[in-house]
């Protein structure tokens, strides 16, 4: 039985598979922050997480998705003041008894160092310092990611 | 280049419902957050509210009981109603792109809407 | 009345600097770096001058700057310009998803 918030997750995310594929971004859009191979942006409004989720859909992008502690401390050096949180695209699975990434994977256990319970309508937000589970029904901030296409260098025959 | 174009009728009656009408041109309207402003005559600007096309809407709380906004993403429209207006309504209303919710970078040119019988 | 308090007006000679004040409270201009201008001449829309305190959207001239100190934030105009006669408004978040205005002040360019 799946929860309210993985019936969201789910259904936004297999609605933005079914979109025609689009041609690959090259440069972040206005007010997105570029890290690495990744466009960033973060909200200045508030809200729960799965409209903070819908939110994201909607810019053709999703919420925030971390691979390792080295993306995450560089995500953390752009958040400028150490009071906020941020909604990133994790929350817990009550099937699965897990941490899910919104794109259908688990939360690798090394991977980031979560304070507080992992249960029934947790979600995860980022401070400047620290990784929390809060209540999917807080109204915090969030963060959208868009994926950069990596150019290619030309490769020019001998003149 | 973002163009809003704002319409509907410029004279409602008081105690009716106001209904305005924003058109984007030039973007896509999903990405951003839309936002209804308004200026009575000389005077000052008053943040009416917004709406997002995930279907959210924030409404300044002076207004919140008389507001209701909402989006129609085919047609690339931003739609205010203001209902049990009286003359204190009278005023330009604009339409403005709401990036992230916490600034405006791009207006409408502006509608006179009188409240008058 | 304007949640944010600015002078009705100020002044100043072509080629000086005029500086434009907007006070608020801990729960809006002194709670988040989120303060906006824009600039109005009569009978038209406003101009997005400044956001975030200081940045400059593109096509916005370097004479305009913004910055906050406490819970005011200010625009200053330099080298100041005929054109740039006009009714100036802040604006700041003020949280739960907020938005408020100053009352506007006129600049006249004498």
């Known amino acids: 039985q799946k929860s309210s918030i993985e019936k969201c997750s789910v259904d936004i995310q297999q609605s933005r598979n079914k979109t025609t594929e689009r041609p690959g971004l090259l440069n972040c859009p206005i007010y997105w922050q570029q890290l690495r191979e990744k466009c960033l942006l973060f909200s200045h409004t508030v809200n729960p997480w799965n409209n903070s989720l819908a939110d994201c859909s909607t810019k053709e992008s999703s919420l925030l998705l971390i691979r390792d502690k080295d993306e995450l401390i560089h995500t953390q050096n752009l958040i400028r003041d150490k009071a906020i949180l941020f909604w990133i695209g994790l929350n817990f699975s009550l099937s699965e008894k897990n941490w899910k990434w919104i794109n259908g994977s688990f939360l690798n256990s090394n991977d980031l160092e979560i304070r507080g319970d992992a249960k029934e309508n947790s979600c995860i937000s980022i401070s400047q310092t620290s990784v929390y589970s809060e209540y999917c029904s807080t109204e915090i901030r969030w963060i959208c990611q868009k994926e950069l296409t990596p150019v290619r260098n030309k490769v020019y025959p001998d003149s | 280049q973002v163009q809003l174009q704002e319409s509907g009728p410029g004279l409602v009656k008081p105690s009716e419902t106001l209904s305005l009408t924003c058109t984007v041109s030039?973007?896509?309207?999903?990405?951003?957050?839309w936002s209804w402003i308004r200026q009575p005559a000389g005077k000052g600007l008053e943040w009416i509210g917004r709406t997002y096309t995930s279907g959210s809407t924030n409404y300044n709380p002076s207004l919140k009981s008389r507001v209701t906004m909402s989006v129609d993403t085919s047609k690339k429209q931003i739609s205010l109603k203001l209902s049990s207006v009286t003359a204190a309504d009278t005023a330009v209303y604009y339409c403005?792109?709401?990036?992230?919710?916490?600034?405006?970078?791009?207006w409408g040119q502006g509608i006179l809407v009188t409240v008058s019988s | 009345q304007s949640a944010l308090t600015q002078p009705p007006s100020a002044s100043g000679s072509p080629g000086q600097s005029v500086t434009i004040s907007c006070t608020g409270t801990s729960s809006d201009v002194g709670g988040y770096n989120y303060v906006s201008w824009y600039q109005q001449h009569p009978g038209k829309a406003p101009k997005f001058m400044i956001y975030e305190v200081s940045k400059r959207p593109s096509g916005v001239p370097d004479r305009f700057s913004g910055s906050k100190s406490g819970n005011t934030a200010s625009l200053t105009v330099s080298g100041l310009q005929a054109e740039d006669e006009a009714d100036y408004y802040c604006?700041?978040?003020?949280?739960?998803?907020?938005?408020?205005f100053g009352g506007g002040t006129k600049l006249t360019v004498l």
């Open positions: 604006s700041s978040y003020a949280g739960i998803n907020n938005v408020v």
């Open positions: 030039g973007d896509s309207i999903n990405s951003y957050y």
């Open positions: 403005a792109r709401d990036p992230l919710g916490t600034f405006f970078d791009y």
